[in-house]
């Protein structure tokens, strides 16, 4: 392992929202774990990076991810509210020059090496739908979230507000 040591009904026109400026409003390192306290880890295998969801052994160090938060402006004519709205979008980078990407065709979450400006597939709308947990919704595919499937990260379609609290799309961030 290595480190650097809504829903369609609720989400409209995400792909049209403009990210305010090109600089993140804040960045920090955190470990990512599931609702059930399994760790998200990253490993180099056959010259590509794999993402795993696993129980760590006692005292095993958690991988850290650089979370970069961006503000995204929603003009009032798109928001449906009659007011300009703002969202938080996040990119996740577990090591230099690599970012989590949504592969909507394969319904998978992958690590890709890329340069800035990052493609839309690397941006996720941040939700906190549950106490002290967050969810990551694809900017490119509203209603699709990063989730856990068979000990891997995958893209999961959430089709109703009731499912926004499904445990497999909830993650915890920890800076310790």
């Amino acid at each position: 392992a290595f480190g650097i040591s809504g829903v369609q009904k609720y989400t409209r026109a995400l792909h049209d929202s403009s990210i305010t400026g090109i600089s993140p409003i804040t960045e920090y390192l955190a470990s990512l774990s599931t609702y059930n306290d399994q760790s998200i880890t990253f490993a180099l295998e056959d010259e590509s990076y794999e993402i795993y969801v696993e129980d760590l052994k006692k005292d095993e160090k958690k991988d850290k991810v650089l979370l970069s938060y961006y503000e995204s402006q929603h003009p009032s004519n798109e928001s449906g509210d009659g007011v300009d709205g703002k969202m938080l979008m996040v990119t996740l980078s577990p090591t230099k020059d690599f970012w989590l990407h949504a592969n909507n065709k394969e319904h998978s979450v992958e690590l890709h090496k890329c340069e800035k400006p990052l493609p839309d597939q690397a941006f996720f709308v941040l939700h906190n739908m549950h106490s002290n947990c967050v969810s990551f919704e694809c900017k490119t595919d509203p209603g699709v979230f990063i989730g856990v499937k068979d000990n891997h990260l995958a893209l999961i379609k959430v089709d109703s507000s009731e499912n926004l609290c499904t445990e497999n799309i909830l993650f915890k961030l920890s800076e310790t």
């Epitope: 804040t26 509210d81 938080l88 709308v125 939700h127 906190n128 739908m129």
Partner: antibody, heavy 121, light 107 residues
Framework: QVHLKESGPGLVAPSQSLSITCNVS????????VHWIRQTPGRGLDWLGV???????SYNSALMSRLSISEDISKSQVFLKMNDLQTDDSAIYFC???????????????WGQGTLVTVSA | DIQMTQSPASQSASLGESVTITCLAS??????LAWYQQKPGKSPQLLIY???RLADGVPSRFSGSGSGTEFSFKISSLQAEDFVIYYC?????????FGGGTKLEIK
């Protein structure tokens, strides 16, 4: 124009329950969380709970057994119910809207005017 | 729960001066901190969010800094209407706790 307005009973007898309505306009409850906060001269500002976009609810665990938050999306209303009120629950009760869609990380951008609740026999 | 310790509880200053208020979190809160202003008989108003970001319509004489557990809020060139109460609030974890407030008084 974003607007939130609380309406409450004013006076509540000890051991009785409190019901407050927050009427909202200018934004959608399906995009923004609405929080309940109360303020007393002695304790300052206390966060009570939130009805998040999508309908999930988080409470302050210290008051969780006495609190209930709900909504009527069709009427753009959020409700706070609190049971077994005591004199130290006397406070101004506010509802407030998240700054960001779907997330509370940006603080509370719009607040209601507040409603004064006095618990007294 | 995360405790927010705000200091000073009150401060006297003159028009045109600068003042700084600090807020200490009992554990790391990244940059998820907001500052509010409350005028007498009114509800709090968001001034700063995400520790450093100025809310819409807020004058540039207000600024915020810090991350982790230590945060500062500065008002440069105090105006008459600034002599009110200011609160910090952490948005990192529920319950979203507030500092005890700082009352700015005119000297």
């Amino acid at each position: 124009q974003v607007h939130l307005k609380e309406s409450g009973p004013g006076l509540v007898a000890p051991s009785q329950s409190l019901s407050i309505t927050c009427n909202v306009s200018g934004f959608s409850l399906s995009k923004y969380g609405v929080h309940w906060i109360r303020q007393t001269p002695g304790r300052g500002l206390d966060w009570l709970g939130v009805l998040r976009a999508g309908g999930t609810i988080s409470y302050n665990s210290a008051l969780m057994s006495r609190l209930s938050i709900s909504e009527d999306i069709s009427k753009s209303q959020v409700f706070l119910k609190m049971n077994d009120l005591q004199t130290d629950d006397s406070a101004i009760y506010f509802c407030a809207r998240d700054h960001y869609y779907y997330s509370s990380f940006g603080g509370f951008a719009s607040w209601g005017q507040g409603t004064l609740v006095t618990v007294s026999a | 729960d995360i405790q927010m310790t705000q200091s000073p509880a009150s401060q006297s200053a003159s028009l045109g001066e600068s003042v700084t208020i600090t807020c200490l979190a009992s554990q790391t809160i990244a940059t998820w901190l907001a500052w509010y202003q409350q005028k007498p008989g009114k509800s709090p108003q968001l001034l700063i969010y995400a520790a450093t970001r100025l809310a819409d319509g807020v004058p540039s004489r207000f600024s915020g800094s810090g991350s982790g557990t230590e945060f500062s809020f500065k008002i440069s060139s105090l105006q008459a209407e600034d002599f009110v109460i200011y609160y910090c609030q952490q948005l990192y974890n529920t319950p979203y706790t507030f500092g005890g407030g700082t009352k700015l008084e005119i000297k």
